[in-house]
Amino acid sequence: ESLGTEQRVVGRAAEVPGPEPGQQEQLVFGSGDAVELSCPPPGGGPMGPTVWVKDGTGLVPSERVLVGPQRLQVLNASHEDSGAYSCRQRLTQRVLCHFSVRVTDAPSSGDDEDGE
């Protein structure tokens, strides 16, 4: 699935903004990992367009930054991808989900590597 090139034509939504988002989630990834963040809308229904923001700047989808419905993927993560990520309602900038992402220099333990 190529999230980066998909465009969603959106129909009617029954939901209006739900409750305030919960606490910030802290996540650690290894260098080279794919950072995957998921943010289902409160109440389960669509809430108009959303935007992912990193350290205050809106993220534009690219070959490395893939955006899908309520989902963000940053491929081949590096230290520079560490930071505060939020999924916001585009229209109001209301934060739906908030993540603190740290990318360490070492690959994550899930990778197959030869030990010493």
Epitope: Q7, R12, P49
Partner: antibody, heavy 121, light 110 residues
Framework: EVQLLESGGGLVQPGGSLRLSCAAS????????MSWVRQAPGKGLEWVSG????????YYADSVKGRFTISRDNSKNTLYLQMNSLRAEDTAVYYC??????????????WGQGTLVTVSS | QSVLTQPPSASGTPGQRVTISCSGS????????VSWYQQLPGTAPKLLIY???KRPSGVPDRFSGSKSGTSASLAISGLRSEDEADYYC???????????FGGGTKLTVL
């Protein structure tokens, strides 16, 4: 300086098609959400469609759903509106409107001068 | 008929304060921000107010916006002849999944 220049309007028969273009300059086009808004002669503003960079979503007004298609070519800094199965009630000046930066509250902060579409036999 | 309701006309004399109302519902104004646009005769609309009450740079402080519940208002103080224009409110509507505009208010400076 932000500039939006619409083109492609004209006279078309009912049932016909037109493609409007909006050439953008003065800002990083790919990073901004864009919309089309129309105004029938002597009438008020009506939002037609919007394309959102942040999540790739596209929205349409019920009045044009299934007939109009919004798209963009970031390499050409151009927004498009493909209009099919045109009706007399689609006659209007069509404006291209730029939204605010993605990390700010949404609003149409710049507008083009508009292009007139006339649907008549 | 527009989803957002505005009076079709308003008027005032130079120096006066004029208020234009915009009434909606919980699916738009009640749960979203309102913006206001000014359209001078024969020109494209121009942003006047956004996020209910914020003014873009370059817009005189004679223009102010407010919101209460499902209604919004645009106030113009120290009315001038160049304020004669059409004024539109707008908001996103969650149930329609799109932007909606008011029908517009034609302001006449007497």
């Amino acid at each position: 300086e932000v500039q939006l220049l619409e083109s492609g309007g004209g006279l078309v028969q009912p049932g016909g098609s037109l493609r409007l273009s909006c050439a953008a300059s003065g800002f990083t086009f790919s990073s901004y959400d864009m919309s089309w808004v129309r105004q029938a002669p002597g009438k008020g503003l009506e939002w037609v469609s919007g394309i959102y960079s942040g999540d790739g979503s596209i929205y349409y007004a019920d009045s044009v759903k299934g007939r109009f298609t919004i798209s963009r070519d970031n390499s050409k800094n151009t927004l498009y509106l493909q209009m099919n199965s045109l009706r007399a009630e689609d006659t209007a000046v069509y404006y291209c409107a730029k939204d605010a930066p993605m990390n700010e509250m949404s609003r149409f902060d710049y507008w083009g001068q508009g292009t007139l579409v006339t649907v008549s036999s | 008929q527009s989803v957002l309701t505005q009076p079709p006309s308003a008027s005032g004399t130079p120096g006066q304060r004029v208020t234009i109302s915009c009434s909606g519902s919980s699916s738009n104004i009640g749960n979203n921000y309102v913006s206001w646009y000014q359209q001078l005769p024969g020109t494209a609309p121009k942003l006047l107010i956004y996020a209910d009450s914020k003014r873009p740079s370059g817009v005189p402080d004679r223009f102010s916006g407010s919101k209460s519940g499902t209604s919004a208002s645009l106030a113009i103080s120290g009315l001038r002849s160049e304020d004669e224009a059409d004024y539109y409110c707008a908001s996103w509507d969650y149930s329609l999944s799109g932007y909606v505009f008011g029908g517009g208010t034609k302001l006449t400076v007497l």
